[in-house]
C-alpha cells in the first residue's frame, strides 16, 4: 500500500516560518509528489503558485516553506498527491492565522455516517459583529452579533457524506485572512461498517485508527502500526512501518500529521492541541491524547505508547497473559545484492513475537508491486519467506523493500538489487577441422553481449534432428577438440558463457552446423602407375566391389614433383584405369587414389613415375670394373633418374679384334646397377663399353673401359678402369 504522509508544521500561522512536508514512505512514486492549493475546498484563496522543493533529509519527500514575511499569503487549503500504478492518493490540510477571530477545536474531524456531530469554533476575539459560517467557501449560516457564543457550533444531527467539507468561521466584517478552518470528514458508512454498500464489518482499528470505508483496512495514527494499529512505534517514529523519524529536539512536537481520508489530521502520539505542542496529561496517550490508559495491574502509562506491560502480560490494558510482543526485525539481508537476470528467489528472514506468518511478509519491488511469499518456513526464532520472481530483468534494478507487518508491529528493510544481463556470444563457434569422429573448434567466445566477468565457458553440441539433450564440455581455451563424434552426422554447436552468481548461465550463442566425415572406403587395390608416352601416365587398379548401395567413384590425385602442379580426377567406379595426360616429358609425378562415396575414402600410398623422355639418355655414370678373375669381372654403374631408361647394354670384345666380333649383354631391368661378365679368356685385355637406352635411343659413350683378366692361378684384382679414347 502507498504510505503518503503530509506534515503540517504549523497550521496556525504567526510570524514564524511555516511549512508543509509530503513524504512517500517506503515506496517510490512513478510520478513526482505534488503539493498544491486545494481550490475544491476553498475557491477564493490566494492564487500564487507554490514553491515546492525537494526535502533533502528524505529520499522521496517534497516541501513548501513559507518565510515569516509571507504570512499574509498562507491562509487556505492545501493538498499533497502521490501516484503509483495508476492509483492516486490525495491528502488535504489547511493553514490559518493564529490571530484569527475564531479557532477550530480540531483541524479535521472524522465521523461516521449518521453520527450526531457538532463542529465547533472557539471565539478568540470579541467583536460587535455577526458571525458567519461557510462551507467550502459558500455561506451556510450566520449568528447575530449579540448571540455569538464562546463556542460557535454547527450541529449536524445525522451527518451524511455530502456534509463533508471545509467549514470556516469569521466575523462578517472579516475575510479569508481572519477565518478559522476545520475539515469535516464523513465516512461513507456507518460506524464499524465498510464496503461499497457499507454492509461489511470493520476489524477493530485500535488506538484511534480509522477503518477505511472502501477496503476495510485500518489507517493507523502516527506512532502506531500493524493490521489493527495495536502496536506502538518506537519513540518519535511514524509511518506505516514506523521507519520515519521526527528530527526535532522534542520528537514530533509541533508536527500535525495528515493521512489519507478518512483519517484526516492529528498530532503524533503523545501530543495534543491545534499546534501539537502540548504534552498529554497523565493517564492519557496517543494521537491528540484522546486515549485513556486503563492499565490492569497498575502498570505505568506512557504518553507515547500507552500501558507499559510487565513481563508476561500484553494487550492495550496489559489484560492478556503471554509472552510480550516483540516488534519484528529483519535479519541477514545484505544491503546490496547482485542478481543475474532470469529466475530469482529472494529471501526475507525475520524475528519477532509472535513470529511473522507468511501473509505478514511481503516484498515490494521498486515500481511498488507487492510480492507475496512463494514458500515459507519458520524455526523457533525466525520466519523465512522465499519469494519467486520468474524473470527478473535489468529494469528491476533498484531499491527493493522487505516488509514485515505483524500485530507486534511493522518493519521494512530496503536493499539494493543490481540485475545483470547474462552474457551471450555474438558469434557462432568456427569449425577449423573435422574427421569422421572428431572436430576442432574455435569457440569464438568474444565479443559477447551482456555483463561479465565470465566465470566459465561451455561448448554445447548435439546431433541435428536427434531428440537428444545437448551435451557440453567445459572449455578453458578458445581452441578445443570434440572427440567421440558419430561419423557422417550433422552436428549443432554453440557456446554458453557463465558469469558469477546463481543462475549465471547465459543463453547459448548463435549455432554453427557441421558434418563429420564418413568412415572412408579402403583405397583401390593393385594400383600400378606406368608411363605411356612423353605426356601420359597410365594408372591401373583391380576392379572395385563396394559393400554398400551408395554410388562411388575413384578420385585420382596427381602432382608434379618438380613443379607446383596438382590435379584431381574423378573416375567412374566401374573403370579400372585412367590415363593421366597433358603431362610434361621427362617429369616425375606422384599419384594417389581413393574410393569416395558421399564420404571420402582413405588415400592410397603414393605411387611415383616419370613420363617418357624427349631426349637421348645420358651415359651411365660411376662405371667401375671389379672382382676381376681369370675368367670373370663385375661391372657396376649408376644412371640418372627421369630419362625413361628402359635397358642397359654392356658391349665387350678382345682388344685388337674387329668391331663385329663384340658381345652385347642387354640388361632390360633398368634398376639393376651391376653385372658379372663370365667366360672370359685368362690374361686377356678386353675393351668394354656401356650405354643406356630409352624410348628415343641409346646414349653415346665418350670412351671405352679396359679390362685385363688374370692368369689362371692369380687372385682377383680391382681396376680403376683405364680410359681409352676411341
Amino acid at each position: 500500500a502507498m504510505d503518503l504522509i503530509l506534515i503540517n508544521s504549523l497550521p496556525l500561522v504567526s510570524d514564524a516560518e511555516t511549512s508543509l512536508t509530503c513524504i512517500a514512505s517506503g515506496w517510490r512514486p512513478h510520478e513526482p509528489i505534488t503539493i498544491g492549493r486545494d481550490f475544491e475546498a476553498l475557491m477564493n484563496q490566494h492564487q500564487d503558485p507554490l514553491e515546492v522543493t525537494q526535502d533533502v533529509t528524505r529520499e522521496w519527500a517534497k516541501k513548501v516553506v513559507w518565510k515569516r514575511e509571507k504570512a499574509s499569503k498562507i491562509n487556505g487549503a492545501y493538498f499533497c498527491e502521490g501516484r503509483v500504478r495508476g492509483e492516486a492518493i490525495r491528502i488535504r490540510t489547511m493553514k490559518m492565522r493564529q490571530q484569527a477571530s475564531f479557532l477550530p477545536a480540531t483541524l479535521t474531524m472524522t465521523v461516521d455516517k449518521g453520527d450526531n456531530v457538532n463542529i465547533s469554533f472557539k471565539k478568540v476575539l470579541i467583536k460587535e459583529e455577526d458571525a458567519v459560517i461557510y462551507k467550502n467557501g459558500s455561506f451556510i449560516h450566520s449568528v447575530p452579533r449579540h448571540e455569538v457564543p464562546d463556542i460557535l457550533e454547527v450541529h449536524l444531527p445525522h451527518a451524511q457524506p455530502q456534509d463533508a467539507g471545509v467549514y470556516s468561521a469569521r466575523y462578517i466584517g472579516g475575510n479569508l485572512f481572519t477565518s478559522a478552518f476545520t475539515r469535516l470528514i464523513v465516512r461513507r458508512c456507518e460506524a464499524q461498517k465498510w464496503g461499497p454498500e457499507c454492509n461489511h464489518l470493520c476489524t477493530a482499528c485500535m488506538n484511534n485508527g480509522v477503518c477505511h470505508e472502501d477496503t476495510g483496512e485500518c489507517i493507523c495514527p502516527p506512532g502506531f502500526m500493524g493490521r489493527t494499529c495495536e502496536k506502538a512505534c518506537e519513540l518519535h517514529t511514524f509511518g506505516r512501518t514506523c521507519k520515519e523519524r521526527c528530527s526535532g529536539q522534542e520528537g514530533c512536537k509541533s508536527y500535525v500529521f495528515c493521512l489519507p481520508d478518512p483519517y484526516g489530521c492529528s498530532c503524533a502520539t503523545g501530543w495534543k492541541g491545534l499546534q501539537c505542542n502540548e504534552a498529554c496529561h497523565p493517564g492519557f496517550y496517543g494521537p491528540d491524547c484522546k486515549l485513556r490508559c486503563s492499565c490492569n495491574n497498575g502498570e505505568m502509562c506512557d504518553r507515547f505508547q500507552g500501558c507499559l506491560c510487565s513481563p508476561g502480560w500484553q494487550g492495550l490494558q496489559c489484560e492478556r497473559e503471554g509472552i510480550p510482543r516483540m516488534t519484528p526485525k529483519i535479519v541477514d539481508l545484505p544491503d546490496h545484492i547482485e542478481v543475474n537476470s532470469g529466475k530469482f528467489n529472494p529471501i526475507c528472514k525475520a524475528s519477532g513475537w509472535p513470529l511473522p506468518t507468511n501473509e505478514e511478509m511481503t516484498l515490494v519491488k521498486p515500481d511498488g508491486t507487492v510480492l507475496h511469499p512463494k514458500d515459507f518456513n519458520h524455526t523457533d526464532h525466525f520466519s523465512v519467506a522465499i519469494f519467486t520472481i520468474h524473470r527478473i530483468l535489468p529494469p528491476d534494478s533498484g531499491v527493493w523493500v522487505c516488509s514485515v507487518n505483524t500485530v507486534a508491529g511493522m518493519v521494512e528493510k530496503p536493499f539494493n538489487i543490481s540485475v545483470k544481463v547474462l552474457p551471450k556470444p555474438l558469434n557462432a563457434p568456427n569449425v577449423i577441422d573435422t574427421g569422421h569422429n572428431f572436430a576442432v573448434i574455435n569457440i569464438s567466445s568474444e565479443p559477447y553481449f551482456g555483463d561479465g566477468p565470465i566465470k566459465s565457458k561451455k561448448l554445447l553440441y548435439k546431433p541435428v534432428n536427434h531428440y537428444e539433450a545437448w551435451q557440453h564440455i567445459q572449455v578453458t581455451n578458445e581452441i578445443v577438440t570434440l572427440n567421440y563424434l558419430e561419423p557422417r552426422t550433422e552436428y549443432e554447436l554453440c557456446v554458453q558463457l557463465v558469469r558469477r552468481g546463481e543462475g549465471g548461465e547465459g543463453h547459448p550463442g548463435p549455432v554453427r552446423r557441421f558434418t563429420t566425415a564418413s568412415i572412408g572406403l579402403p583405397p583401390p587395390r593393385g594400383l600400378n602407375l606406368l608411363p605411356k608416352s612423353q605426356t601420359t601416365l597410365n594408372l591401373t587398379w583391380q576392379p572395385i566391389f563396394p559393400s554398400s548401395e551408395d554410388d562411388f567413384y575413384v578420385e585420382v590425385e596427381r602432382r608434379s614433383v618438380q613443379k607446383s602442379d596438382q590435379q584431381n580426377i574423378k573416375v567412374p567406379g566401374n573403370l579400372t584405369s585412367v590415363l593421366l595426360n597433358n603431362l610434361h616429358p621427362r617429369e616425375q609425378y606422384v599419384v594417389r587414389a581413393r574410393v569416395n562415396t558421399k564420404a571420402q575414402g582413405e588415400w592410397s600410398e603414393d605411387l611415383t613415375a616419370w613420363t617418357l623422355s624427349d631426349i637421348l639418355p645420358p651415359q651411365p655414370e660411376n662405371i667401375k670394373i671389379s672382382n676381376i678373375t681369370h675368367s670373370s669381372a663385375v661391372i657396376s654403374w649408376t644412371i640418372l633418374d627421369g630419362y625413361s631408361i628402359s635397358s642397359i647394354t654392356i658391349r665387350y670384345k678382345v682388344q685388337g679384334k674387329n668391331e663385329d666380333q663384340h658381345v652385347d649383354v642387354k640388361i632390360k631391368n633398368a634398376t639393376i646397377t651391376q653385372y658379372q661378365l663370365k667366360g672370359l679368356e685368362p690374361e686377356t685385355a678386353y675393351q668394354v663399353d656401356i650405354f643406356a637406352e630409352n624410348n628415343i635411343g641409346s646414349s653415346n659413350p665418350a670412351f671405352s673401359h679396359e679390362l685385363v683378366t688374370l692368369p689362371e692361378s692369380q687372385a682377383p684384382a680391382d681396376l680403376g678402369g683405364g680410359k681409352m679414347l676411341l
Epitope: 464496503g195 461499497p196 461489511h200 477493530a204 476495510g216 495495536e230
Partner: antibody
C-alpha cells in the same frame, strides 16, 4: 501461526439444537470480525453468519435467521454458533473463518453436522 | 443478493496446459470510487477447507504460486492456471464481497485429462 480449531459437530435429530465452537490462536481475536460458512455434502459454499469484533453487530443468512445465533467470548478467544430447530437441509460441514477485507483468509478445519431422524 | 455463476461446472485439462475458469456476477462488483473489483477466488481440495487464492479479483494471496492469475472487471471474471500441475486438482469457487451477504459461485471441478 494463526489457527482456528473447531469443535462440537455430530449427528442430531431434526428440531433439536447443537452448539459449534471455534477457538482462535495466533491473532488478537478481539480485533477481528468472525464468519461461519457451511458446505452441504457435494455442494458449494454458503455463508451463514458474521459477528463484529466487539460482538455488537450480527448478521445472518435468510436461511438460518431466527434459528441460529452467533456469539463470541473475546476473553476466551472463542466463537460460537448456537443452532436451534435444526432441519435436514442444515446438514453440512461448518467452517469458521476470519476475514481479510471481504475475503475469508483463515479457515477452521471444519466440523460435520448431520441432521437426521 | 448478488448471484455468482461459474462456468464450466467441470473442466478436464492436460498437465502443463492452461486452465480457465469463468465467473459471472448478477450485478457489477466494480466500485468506481476506487476502481477495485470486490471479488475473491478460492481453491478447495477434498476433505480440506477452502484456501484463499485471490482477492480484489487479481491480487494473489501470499504463498499462492504465480501460475494462478485473476482477471476481469465489472461482472465477468476469469481465474487462469497457466500451466496445470497435478496438485491443482480441486474445486474452485469465486466469491463477491461487494455487498453483504457475501455469496459464492457454485464451484468448478478441475481434473486432469
Amino acid at each position: 501461526q494463526v489457527q482456528l480449531v473447531q469443535s462440537g459437530g455430530g449427528v442430531v435429530q431434526p428440531g433439536r439444537s447443537l452448539r459449534l465452537s471455534c477457538a482462535a490462536s495466533g491473532l488478537t481475536f478481539s480485533n477481528y470480525a468472525m464468519h461461519w460458512v457451511r458446505q452441504a455434502p457435494g455442494k458449494g459454499l454458503e455463508w451463514v453468519a458474521v459477528i463484529s469484533y466487539d460482538g455488537e453487530n450480527k448478521y445472518y443468512a435468510d436461511s438460518v435467521k431466527g434459528r441460529f445465533t452467533i456469539s463470541r467470548d473475546n476473553s476466551k478467544n472463542m466463537l460460537q454458533l448456537q443452532m436451534n430447530r435444526l432441519r435436514s437441509e442444515d446438514t453440512a460441514v461448518y467452517y469458521c473463518a476470519t476475514p481479510k477485507g471481504g475475503a475469508l483468509e483463515i479457515w477452521g478445519q471444519g466440523t460435520v453436522i448431520t441432521v437426521s431422524s | 443478493d448478488i448471484q455468482m455463476t461459474q462456468s464450466p461446472d467441470s473442466l478436464a485439462v492436460s498437465l502443463g496446459e492452461r486452465a480457465t475458469i469463468n465467473c459471472k456476477s448478477s450485478q457489477s462488483v466494480l466500485y468506481s470510487s476506487n476502481n477495485k473489483n470486490y471479488l475473491a477466488w478460492y481453491q478447495q481440495k477434498p476433505g480440506q477447507p477452502p484456501n484463499l487464492l485471490m482477492y480484489w479479483a487479481s491480487t494473489r494471496e501470499s504463498g499462492v504460486p504465480d501460475r494462478f492469475s485473476g482477471s476481469g472487471s465489472g461482472t465477468d471474471f476469469t481465474l487462469t492456471i497457466s500451466s496445470l500441475q497435478a496438485e491443482d486438482v480441486a474445486v474452485y469457487y469465486c466469491q463477491q464481497y461487494y455487498s453483504a451477504p457475501i455469496t459464492f459461485g457454485q464451484g468448478t471441478r478441475l481434473e486432469i485429462k
